[in-house]
Amino acid sequence: ECGHISVSAPIVHLGDPITASCIIKQNCSHLDPEPQILWRLGAELQPGGRQQRLSDGTQESIITLPHLNHTQAFLSCCLNWGNSLQILDQVELRAGYPPAIPHNLSCLMNLTTSSLICQWEPGPETHLPTSFTLKSFKSRGNCQTQGDSILDCVPKDGQSHCCIPRKHLLLYQNMGIWVQAENALGTSMSPQLCLDPMDVVKLEPPMLRTMDPSPEAAPPQAGCLQLCWEPWQPGLHINQKCELRHKPQRGEASWALVGPLPLEALQYELCGLLPATAYTLQIRCIRWPLPGHWSDWSPSLELRTTERAPTVRLDTWWRQRQLDPRTVQLFWKPVPLEEDSGRIQGYVVSWRPSGQAGAILPLCNTTELSCTFHLPSEAQEVALVAYNSAGTSRPTPVVFSESRGPALTRLHAMARDPHSLWVGWEPPNPWPQGYVIEWGLGPPSASNSNKTWRMEQNGRATGFLLKENIRPFQLYEIIVTPLYQDTMGPSQHVYAYSQEMAPSHAPELHLKHIGKTWAQLEWVPEPPELGKSPLTHYTIFWTNAQNQSFSAILNASSRGFVLHGLEPASLYHIHLMAASQAGATNSTVLTLMTLTPEGSELH
């Protein structure tokens, strides 16, 4: 060995100075008599080495690195040897920080593994090998006096938790517990915990179960769930309080908490939930009134609440077949009476014959919003109900009576926008109780079965906005019928468009006669179409070769037009625009050439 490095300290605080010396022995005969010692930190040459010859003939170089900013680096002592640098010796330098105080030390007692599990946060990176040790002792009091020490608990590399096994624990007695962190630059200790392992016990949650329905027990009410929980057996003798959380499976609702609940609820009814809704439920418990930790949430239980009978008003309307007045078509609409009015599974129309107490004859059972049935000759009234698995709505009586009430007057309709129509009227005297408004496609597409209808409950209303099933460019028939206490008035109807269509095409222009300075044009008007507003006018446009444009407006009954003042032997482009209130459309372009001055007129 020709050279040897010694350093003031191989491990320092990051950023601190470090001093190193390199001594080269005299007996390295192959060297220069006066060799120049060089220093290198990692791959970089370091200036500032002070070299001297010692009395024994050895050469010494001393260097001070003012700030070691590498967490790990090799410091080399070198000589130039020919064209290369010869390393005589090198040392590893490390820099970092002393360990910070470990914080957030907490422990849990696990009764299944019979161990106390403690965890902590080690603090910022030290850049140096740092060991953590969980230290503890038994204490009779509040940890002011130290009893027997407990064997140190050393976590596996990189872990920030450690388990103290049962044989080192004393339950119902306090233990002092802390974490010690140590590296080459120092030692630190966390604040000490003083705890009885049973006071940090973390229990397993109970198992949620649904109640097995018993024949004598009443079924749960709508919006309620019957459930029970099976306590975790090893924690059975520990007094606990529990809490339940639930949320609907669908949607974005957050968990709702219910508690505190007793651990030993043999059965529990949870109410105030949405009917006919699937819920996810979980439970957790904590030792109580003594200290402890909340258990994890239990595995989920998924249950569906029972539904409630429909709480709806049924608005009804009916029509008799013209050929067979005993065949009735009944229509209805459910109107919710509450925010949650219950699911509707279907509808039943029934009739109770007079004199037959209790006998109810169903006329139809359907999931649709209408049904057609034959009305028994003595029947003047039927009952309509909505039903589901929980029961039926209140029956809605439907009375079939003649039209004996007064008619409304001045029925009119106007477009609001392409998808709505306003229908207005003057109410009759006396005021009706309400109105039925029906609407559907007018001729030629009219159909009784495809009509939409609405009930207007306000008898003083003078109009109604139709927003359902209204499309532009269609003719609609609107029928309004006033409703009275036990009868109705005659129906009135009106036709209207919500939006009319511009002409689909303009007539084709034809040249009838042409001269040197004039041209006579004609066209065949398009036949009127349903859904398209009538023409208001035509505009004829002509352009010469110099791109000068001219136009003339003609009334909608025009069938032809003569262009005057044209240049002889000139080319013209002509087109016709047909316009209505809904828009305008252009014809194709007709190109013609006027005659030369020498030519004769063409007729």
């Epitope: 019979s114 306590p231 003798h237 007793p262």
Partner: antibody
């Protein structure tokens, strides 16, 4: 100091009934599970029944299920064991015990002798 | 049901002896094992709970160990007042079964 005092033992004919009581003092009775353990003459210990702090959970040994009923009155700090349809094999000293959080029988009464014989 | 088997059923020992009694569960019971001492005509007394925890007031010569299915009660130096019958009991689940007992007699 925890004290448990059993009473109600005695001689009864097969098929008869007895009600044992256990008066508790020296601790908060309503916070603890309680139980009954019996010991037939010259035999080992046999667990009979336990009851949770509020009385909601009441497990029984198969040998007494359907015949014995455990109950408690937290307002009176008293534990009961109603024994019906008694059999000769129910003859034993019946001990009342206070249970700890880990199911251990922490404290015991002095016992009351029940003899079932014709 | 979890069955508890104690051995030996009886043993003779002298004052100062180290005595070991074992208890085996028919299935794993974690640390839910308790030891009791009973003297003739007296009520049982809790010695060790949760396999190794000494009940308050019990001399430190008594110790418990084991977990799962195999458990041991050790009396490090037998004293005259220790001659009695010892029972183990599992408290993991119901029914709570006791072992058959071990009678410690004077040799």
């Amino acid at each position: 100091e925890v004290q448990l005092l059993e009473s109600g033992g005695g001689l009864v004919q097969p098929g008869g009934s007895l009600r044992l009581s256990c008066a508790a003092s020296g601790f908060t009775f309503s916070l603890y599970w309680m139980g009954w353990v019996r010991q037939a003459p010259g035999k080992g210990l046999e667990w009979v029944s336990s009851i949770s702090s509020s009385g909601g959970v009441t497990p029984y040994a198969d040998s007494v299920k359907g015949r014995f009923t455990i109950s408690r009155d937290n307002s009176k700090n008293t534990l009961y064991l109603q024994m019906n349809s008694l059999r000769a094999e129910d003859t034993a000293v019946y001990y009342c015990a206070k249970l700890g959080e880990l199911g251990q029988f922490m404290d015991w009464g002095q016992g009351t002798l029940v003899t079932v014989s014709s | 049901d979890i069955q508890m088997t104690q051995s030996p059923s009886s043993l003779s020992a002298s004052v100062g002896d180290r005595v070991t009694i074992t208890c085996r569960a028919s299935q794993g019971i974690s640390s839910y094992l308790n030891w009791y001492q009973q003297k003739p005509g007296k009520a049982p007394k809790l010695l060790i709970y949760y396999a190794s925890n000494l009940q308050n007031g019990v001399p430190s010569r008594f110790s418990g160990s084991g977990s799962g299915t195999d458990f041991t009660l050790t009396i490090s130096s037998l004293q005259p007042e220790d001659f009695a019958t010892y029972y183990c009991q599992q408290s993991l689940e119901y029914p709570q079964m006791f072992g058959g007992g071990t009678k410690v007699e004077i040799k």
